[in-house]
Interface confidence: low
Amino acid sequence: DFGLDCDEHSTESRCCRYPLTVDFEAFGWDWIIAPKRYKANYCSGECEFVFLQKYPHTHLVHQANPRGSAGPCCTPTKMSPINMLYFNGKEQIIYGKIPAMVVDRCGCS
Amino acid sequence: DFGLDCDEHSTESRCCRYPLTVDFEAFGWDWIIAPKRYKANYCSGECEFVFLQKYPHTHLVHQANPRGSAGPCCTPTKMSPINMLYFNGKEQIIYGKIPAMVVDRCGCS
């Protein structure tokens, strides 16, 4: 699998992964004990036909061209979890692995 | 996990899974021996904020609102393989499981 990596200086218009640090304190999410911030990344950019298509299915839908089907969009194709320490609704402290919190790769699907 | 199922008569505007039969013969893909057609399905519809969001990450990016980040889009969140019999580039007959050929669920990511 392959995905583009970009930053704020990139001139790339195609689907790309960009850096993003999520700051829970800045959001006022005080129920999150740790991490206070983490590197989440995000996907942005255009999905020209066939570029970075993760699935053959995407190509097939384009071929079949059903009513209402939009073109593929730039979305996470590989994600990772992070470990978090947080208060649940009952004010208990929970330590757990939260899935799909970090974008590792972006693609068109 | 939860996803909406629709058909061509549905009035649903939100992200939904629609039926789609892919016909390889109609595409002229004569290197595919079997199946000649299969039910692929596809995703279409709007992704209002929070509706059918697969990942907490999607919500966090919306909160952080980085430059160039589009809203979430309606995309497959669960897919299945199908078994296929086909000619490869060397004219050998291959039987194999092809991943991510069927959309089982759609969501916003």
Partner: antibody
């Protein structure tokens, strides 16, 4: 006790090879990223490379081709194979563990070994 | 590749004084910066990660700040045991896999 212990350092002739080992204890090797960092006498820290949780390896541009990182989960050990050694490779070689910082970091090393000295000289 | 530049090279201060160490990146690295402390004959010790988050067990007199290209490590009240060389470190690009260290700042106690 959670620790990393490097071994395998010593004197080697220019052009020679050496394999360093890093034995880990007190935690599961495959759950963390491992890195190698070196420090020439009286100089600063220089990153060599890492092996990630999936077993993929990444190297500093200068290390590619000459240095290889691997691991043996059954022995809870990470290795650094060094080939075509030069005098400028003389350094203390540290093994380090990626930081379990509740975030997602391949590169903050919060647990280090004491280092093993490699001297390249004829 | 990103290049990290630390200043000053050496700093000599008295106990109780406020210490400010600087680290500059050749391009924006967002918050992707760590600080390490290394004493002679010892391995480095992680002090701060993600620019401002204190690592476990690190005294609160250490404080990291900055984002983008300019970062600072502040020791609010220098203690004799803080005599060491301090390194900043970043990740080369967002692919998580390249690491670059600064050349270090040596802090001496007068």
């Amino acid at each position: 006790e959670v620790q990393l212990v490097e071994s395998g350092g010593g004197l080697v002739q220019p052009g020679g090879s050496l394999r360093l080992s890093c034995a880990v204890s007190g935690f599961t090797l495959s759950h963390y990223v491992k890195g190698w960092v070196r420090q020439a006498p009286g100089k600063g820290l220089e990153w060599i490379g890492i092996i990630n949780i999936e077993g993929e390896t990444y190297y500093a541009s200068w290390a590619k081709g000459r240095f290889t990182i691997s691991r043996d989960n059954s022995k809870n050990t990470v290795y650094l194979q060094m080939n075509s050694l030069r005098a400028e490779d003389t350094a203390v070689y540290f093994c380090a563990r990626g930081h379990d910082n509740f975030g997602y970091s391949y590169h903050d090393f919060n647990l280090w070994g004491q280092g093993t000295l490699v001297t390249v000289s004829s | 590749a990103v290049v990290m530049t630390q200043s000053p090279a050496t700093l000599s201060l008295s106990p109780g004084e406020r210490v400010t160490l600087s680290c500059q990146a050749s391009q924006s690295i967002h918050h992707d910066l760590s600080w390490y402390q290394q004493k002679p004959g010892q391995p480095p010790k992680l002090l701060i990660y993600l620019a401002s988050t204190l690592a476990s067990g690190v005294p609160s007199r250490f404080k990291g700040s900055g984002s983008g290209t300019d970062f600072t490590l502040t020791i609010s009240s220098l203690q004799p045991e803080d005599a060491a060389t301090y390194y900043c470190q970043t990740y080369d690009g967002i692919s998580h896999y390249g690491v670059a260290f600064g050349q270090g700042t040596k802090v001496e106690i007068k």
